[in-house]
Interface confidence: low
């Protein structure tokens, strides 16, 4: 379900009625941040609020996937008057607050990026003292993780009538193009299924019928690089098995 809240122009509730934009809740996040897998990325988030000199307890939260309802990946809390936001949650220890919430900055650093981190992230701040107020970015920042191709699986499988087929699955962003090469094949894109449902960065290519013994090579390529892996097919003639 979707947790949703309202105020004005993406705000949550104010405890006072304000019309000056500088006094209203607002949150500034870029639409997108790009970084390569393995590297770190910074998700910027700054905010304004209507409580002129708030120094009470506060909590900074980042969540992934969707606003209000998505799982939290980071949370920290600062005591009254403190500029130290004590981390209470950092998923897999890879999330770290760069900004100072007391200075209206919730910017977050994400370490050791993986393709699975490619999602939308939403920052949120909660005031919990005399003022009870909070605000969350509804549109969030998209973290776009790029990655050179990596072949995650290559295999030969039996198919009907003593035939064999080959499967190659690779991941990467942009999703890589796959090509097979092998005996009597030249270069073939084969039957490419891309991307797999629920696995946005995975691409699979199938060779439906292997007609010759020998080495079959799958090559995955995108703008960041290429990767290849091979599988060998040796049929025992007169038998129904194969060695791969």
């Amino acid at each position: 379900f979707v947790r949703t809240k309202i105020d004005t122009t993406e705000n949550l509730l104010n405890t006072e009625v304000h019309s000056s934009p500088a006094q209203r809740w607002s949150m500034q996040v870029p639409p997108e941040v790009s970084a390569e897998a393995g590297d770190a990325a910074v998700l910027p988030c700054t905010f304004t609020h209507p409580h002129r000199h708030y120094d009470g307890p506060l909590t900074a939260i980042w969540r992934a996937g969707e606003p209000y309802a998505g799982p939290q990946v980071f949370r920290c809390a600062a005591a009254r008057g403190s500029e130290l936001c004590q981390t209470a949650l950092s998923l897999h220890g890879r999330f770290r607050l760069l900004g100072n919430p007391r200075r209206n900055d919730l910017s977050l650093r994400v370490e050791r990026l993986a393709l699975a981190d490619d999602r939308r992230y939403f920052c949120r701040v909660e005031f919990a003292g005399d003022v009870h107020d909070r605000y969350e970015s509804r549109h969030g920042v998209r973290l776009h993780v790029t990655a050179a191709p990596r072949i995650v699986n290559i295999s030969v499988l039996p198919s009907p009538a003593h035939a064999f087929r080959a499967l190659c699955t690779a991941e990467g962003e942009p999703p890589p193009a796959l090509a097979w090469s092998g005996p009597a094949l030249g270069n073939s894109l084969a039957a490419v299924r891309s991307p797999r449902e629920g696995h946005g960065h995975l691409v699979t290519a199938e060779l439906p019928a292997l007609t010759h013994d020998g080495r079959y090579t799958c090559t995955a390529a995108n703008s960041l690089g290429r990767s290849e892996a091979s599988v060998y097919l040796f049929r025992f003639h007169g038998a129904s098995g194969a060695s791969t």
Epitope: V2, K5, I6, T9, L13, H132, R138, H139
Partner: antibody, heavy 123, light 112 residues
Framework: EIQLQQSGAEVKKPGSSVKVSCKAS????????MHWVKQAPGHGLEWIGT????????AYNQKFKGKATLTADRSTSTAYMELSSLTSEDTAVYYC????????????????WGQGTLVTVSS | DIVMTQSPLSLPVTPGEPASISCRST???????????LYWYLQKPGQSPQLLIY???NLASGVPDRFSGSGSGTDFTLKISRVEAEDVGVYYC?????????FGGGTKVEIK
């Protein structure tokens, strides 16, 4: 099905108070802020204020500050509006309405309304 | 406060004919995020208001596509391409750019 069921009509004496209720069903009560709107006889719509049922945080139209008090009871999924120091000017139909959002269509508007509660102030 | 002004006050219509209602705000309702925070509601006789259009031009769920909303930052129009008998009632515009939310005075649509 989302429904907002308001309490029945009230006749009150000048100077007294009235508390109108709005019971929400068909959705998670704390998901959407509850707003209150006034419609005096033969008149248009006037926004009174709003409450976040999750925290009790409120925002009011300055005109209704001190007149209306908004509260919410999460255990019964019910929002309340209390009007104090009633005068004939407070005679009106009062509506509760939830401001609805979806993830794909962020702000959809006052999509769900109660049936209205007529408050008559008369000596 | 943002003042919303509607015209006309009353609109006699013929079924099957088009109709148009105007709404003007004293401040631009176009936010820097690209959204225009103008909403249209219809209150049929004896009923609660119902949402027709959200964010200036988006048709609310279940609303017939003969209704459409358009406009700029301060001038808005609700159009009914072919009025039907069931469309009678009072139409209100509302701004949700900033507190307090404010409604227009309403336009009463009635069959000639």
């Amino acid at each position: 099905e989302i429904q907002l069921q308001q309490s029945g009509a009230e006749v009150k004496k000048p100077g007294s108070s009235v508390k109108v209720s709005c019971k929400a069903s068909g959705y998670t009560f704390t998901d959407y802020d509850m707003h209150w709107v006034k419609q005096a006889p033969g008149h248009g719509l006037e926004w009174i204020g709003t409450i976040d049922p999750e925290t009790g945080g409120t925002a009011y139209n300055q005109k209704f500050k001190g007149k209306a008090t908004l509260t919410a009871d999460r255990s019964t999924s019910t929002a309340y509006m209390e009007l104090s120091s009633l005068t004939s000017e407070d005679t009106a139909v009062y509506y509760c309405t939830s401001f609805y959002y979806t993830y794909s269509n962020y702000d959809v508007g006052f999509a769900y309304w109660g049936q209205g509660t007529l408050v008559t102030v008369s000596s | 406060d943002i003042v919303m002004t509607q015209s006309p006050l009353s609109l006699p219509v013929t079924p099957g004919e088009p109709a148009s209602i105007s709404c003007r705000s004293t401040k631009s309702l176009l936010h820097s995020n690209g959204n225009t925070y103008l909403y249209w509601y219809l209150q049929k006789p004896g009923q609660s208001p119902q949402l027709l259009i959200y964010r200036m031009s988006n048709l609310a769920s279940g609303v017939p596509d003969r209704f459409s909303g358009s406009g700029s930052g301060t001038d808005f129009t609700l159009k009914i391409s072919r009025v039907e008998a069931e469309d009678v009632g009072v139409y209100y515009c509302m701004q949700h750019l900033e507190y307090p939310f404010t409604f227009g005075g309403g336009t009463k649509v009635e069959i000639k």
